[in-house]
């Protein structure tokens, strides 16, 4: 049974040209996190954090994505095209897969950055189904 909950930074905004931290946190489960995938709104992968092997930043984002803090991701040199949904996918054993959603709005104006931290519903599957493409699961 999947008991975990994903907490994310929720809906956040940041200035064009600035940077933002995308954070997810898995709680209420003893499951072992084997890998976290960070994915963009168009289903392109930004980064992988493998528990054993460390980080891999995908080449399309190599100049403006930095790993961390923690299992989070720092997105730099923001453009208006970065506005949209971001997903963290936690692969865990024995629970299976948990997924969190963050919505980032990149602002032209000098509106101050803010973040609303809140709990979102989890989306989970049995571990045996991990062959499925996780990016087929939408909110």
């Amino acid at each position: 049974m999947m008991t975990g909950t994903i907490e994310t930074t929720g809906n956040i905004s940041a200035k064009k040209g600035g940077s933002v931290i995308l954070q997810c946190h898995l709680s209420s489960t003893m499951a072992q996190v084997t890998q976290v995938n960070w994915e963009q709104h168009d289903h392109s992968l930004l980064a992988i954090r493998n528990a054993e092997l460390g980080w891999h930043i995908y080449p399309a984002f190599k100049d403006r994505v930095a790993p961390g803090p923690g299992l989070g991701l720092t997105l730099q040199s923001l453009t208006m095209n970065d506005t949209g949904e971001y997903f963290c996918t936690y692969h865990t054993y024995p629970d299976g897969t948990y997924r969190g959603r963050i919505f980032l709005e990149v602002l032209e104006s000098s509106v101050a950055e803010h973040s609303a931290r809140f709990q979102i519903p989890i989306e989970g599957r049995d571990y045996k189904d991990d062959d499925d493409k996780h990016h087929h699961h939408h909110h």
Partner: antibody, heavy 121, light 106 residues
Framework: EVQLVESGGGLVKPGGSLRLSCAAS????????MSWVRQAPGKGLEWVGR??????????DYAAPVKGRFTISRDDSKNTLYLQMNSLKTEDTAVYCC????????????WGQGTLVTVSS | PYELTQAPSVSVSPGQAASITCSGD??????ACWYQQKPGQSPVLVIY???KRPSGIPERFSGSNSGNTATLTISGTQAMDEADYYC?????????FGGGTKLTVL
């Protein structure tokens, strides 16, 4: 120590099939993205295709010359990578090597010696 | 299909720096890797993710990648560096090798 050992090569007639295997050891195979690369006699390196880890969908990508004829699969429980080659052509003659895609700093292992596939009538 | 172009051959004197280039459309948006292959041997990865060196590869090997060109530089080239060098463009959907450059140490 990271080790990759390919097997299954041999002589096959045009239009025939062959299945290559790659036995991996010394690392957690299930974490790795794995590719097949080939080298025809006296020629350069040519990427054949790859399979991603299951935590990245387990999806496959292929080079245009082999798409629709070759299939890459993996058995993480056996630490083994496979290349099923169908409708073989003479131009598929090459040494076939399995390789670890260089995603991670601590997993950039050596290549195996490869296995020779000869397609000839 | 995506293509990478390498010069067929490069010559260098011992102790000098050798530069081997690889060009491809928007190559800087992908990761460039470099492989060294000596006669009768399997290729060895010498640079990955543009500029990273695997453990065991000497510091004289370095790499860069921007725009349409990736460059492998060998500073203080030694006779043992004579080999074929292949560039590779790597991203999450495809992988392509260049045609290879034969490095001759005069």
């Amino acid at each position: 120590e990271v080790q990759l050992v390919e097997s299954g090569g041999g002589l096959v007639k045009p239009g025939g099939s062959l299945r290559l295997s790659c036995a991996a050891s010394g690392f957690t195979f299930s974490n790795a993205w794995m590719s097949w690369v080939r080298q025809a006699p006296g020629k350069g390196l040519e990427w054949v295709g790859r399979i991603k880890s299951k935590t990245n969908g387990g999806t496959t990508d292929y080079a245009a010359p082999v798409k629709g004829r070759f299939t890459i699969s993996r058995d993480d429980s056996k630490n083994t990578l496979y290349l099923q080659m169908n409708s073989l052509k003479t131009e598929d003659t090459a040494v076939y090597c399995c390789t670890i895609d260089p995603l991670y700093d601590i997993l950039t292992g050596p290549w195996g010696q490869g296995t020779l596939v000869t397609v000839s009538s | 299909p995506y293509e990478l172009t390498q010069a067929p051959s490069v010559s260098v004197s011992p102790g000098q720096a050798a530069s081997i280039t690889c060009s491809g459309d928007k190559l800087g948006d992908k990761y460039a890797c470099w492989y060294q292959q000596k006669p009768g041997q399997s290729p060895v990865l010498v640079i990955y993710q543009d500029s990273k060196r695997p453990s065991g590869i000497p510091e004289r090997f370095s790499g860069s990648n921007s725009g349409n060109t990736a460059t492998l530089t060998i500073s203080g080239t030694q006779a043992m560096d004579e080999a074929d060098y292949y560039c590779q463009a790597w991203d999450s959907s495809t992988v392509v090798f260049g045609g290879g450059t034969k490095l001759t140490v005069l």
